[in-house]
């Protein structure tokens, strides 16, 4: 669902997301600190263009654990 | 209070274009996206693409895609939606509606309607 | 595209009447399902959200019910002025769609 060219909007990004994070938690609008561009939010990065699990990641409330 | 405030009805020839304006307010503008939805005489309602009025990025339906452009001025509040090329079935009432949250939980403010009528 | 079927409609009903309106998507839209209520020359109204959740300022009487594929909209007591079409409205991916309408009537 979020291969290349493709977009996610709505519901669908949420529970993407949701399954993505986990129980890390997400933002919408990822943290200044965190962005190594002009961050736009979610919505403009997945729904209004196409967006990658990588960068779906980039929105987890916290790194995941390396085991 | 929180409103939306649209440009009065249209008599457009086909071919012609329209712009229709909702100015917001009651509320932080830039902070929700905003809907543009249409509703031909008697029929059911039809999503035709949204705005993000903070950075004016778009995302439309495909059925519009070349035909329709939605743009904002956050000096007063306001979201346009032009539509070109119009035809007779381009007839309708079209509305602005405001983005609950995220695109995923509906629209819970509205314009009062714009009727635009093509014809000849 | 998902597309959203409603029934039946219209819908005949009498003052006091417990009305119950259904909307089906054609694929699975988990509880991303809206209810909206129009009156003629009237824009539409916000009723319910997230398939359940009944938004601000609307009576109680209205309420919401269903996951997946098929939803729910129920008046427990019709009162006059509900008497309008209701739209379901999916809001799990774009293009949002909205069901055909359900247009409830005075018997």
């Known amino acids: 669902a979020y291969g290349p060219g493709e977009t996610l909007c709505g519901g669908e990004l949420v529970d993407t997301l949701q399954f993505v994070c986990s129980d890390r938690g997400f933002y919408f609008s990822r943290p200044s600190s965190r962005a190594n561009r002009r961050s736009r939010g979610i919505v403009e990065e997945c729904c209004f263009r196409s967006c990658d699990l990588a960068l779906l990641e980039t929105y987890c409330a916290t790194p995941a654990k390396s085991e | 209070q929180v409103q939306l405030v649209q440009s009065g009805a249209e008599v457009k020839k086909p071919g012609a274009s329209v712009k229709v304006s909702c100015k917001a307010s009651?509320?932080?503008?830039?902070?929700?996206?905003m809907h543009w939805v249409r509703q031909a005489p008697g029929q059911g309602l039809e999503w035709m693409g949204i705005?993000?009025?903070?950075?004016?990025?778009?995302s439309y339906a495909q059925k519009f895609q070349g035909r329709v452009t939605m743009t904002r001025d956050t000096s007063t509040s306001t979201v346009y939606m032009e539509l070109s090329r119009l035809r007779s079935d381009d007839t309708a009432v079209y509305y602005c509606?405001?983005?609950?949250?995220?695109?995923?939980?509906?629209?819970?403010?509205w314009g009062q309607g714009t009727t635009v009528t093509v014809s000849s | 595209d998902i597309q959203m079927t409603q029934s039946p409609s219209p819908l005949s009903a009498s003052v006091g009447d417990r009305v119950t309106i259904t909307c089906r998507a054609s694929?699975?839209?988990?509880?991303?399902l809206n209810w909206y209520q129009q009156k003629p020359g009237k824009a539409p109204k916000l009723l319910i959200y997230?398939?359940?959740s009944l938004q601000s300022g609307v009576p109680s009487r209205f309420s919401g019910s269903g996951s997946g594929t098929d939803f729910t909209l129920t008046i427990s007591s019709l009162q006059p002025e509900d008497f309008a079409t209701y739209y379901c409205?999916?809001?799990?991916?774009?293009?949002?769609?909205f069901g055909g309408g359900t247009k409830v009537e005075i018997k």
């Open positions: 509606a405001r983005d609950v949250q995220w695109l995923a939980y509906g629209m819970d403010v």
């Open positions: 009651g509320y932080t503008f830039t902070s929700y996206y």
């Open positions: 705005i993000n009025p903070s950075g004016g990025s778009t």
């Open positions: 694929q699975s839209i988990s509880s991303y």
């Open positions: 997230a398939a359940s």
């Open positions: 409205q999916q809001s799990y991916s774009t293009p949002l769609t």
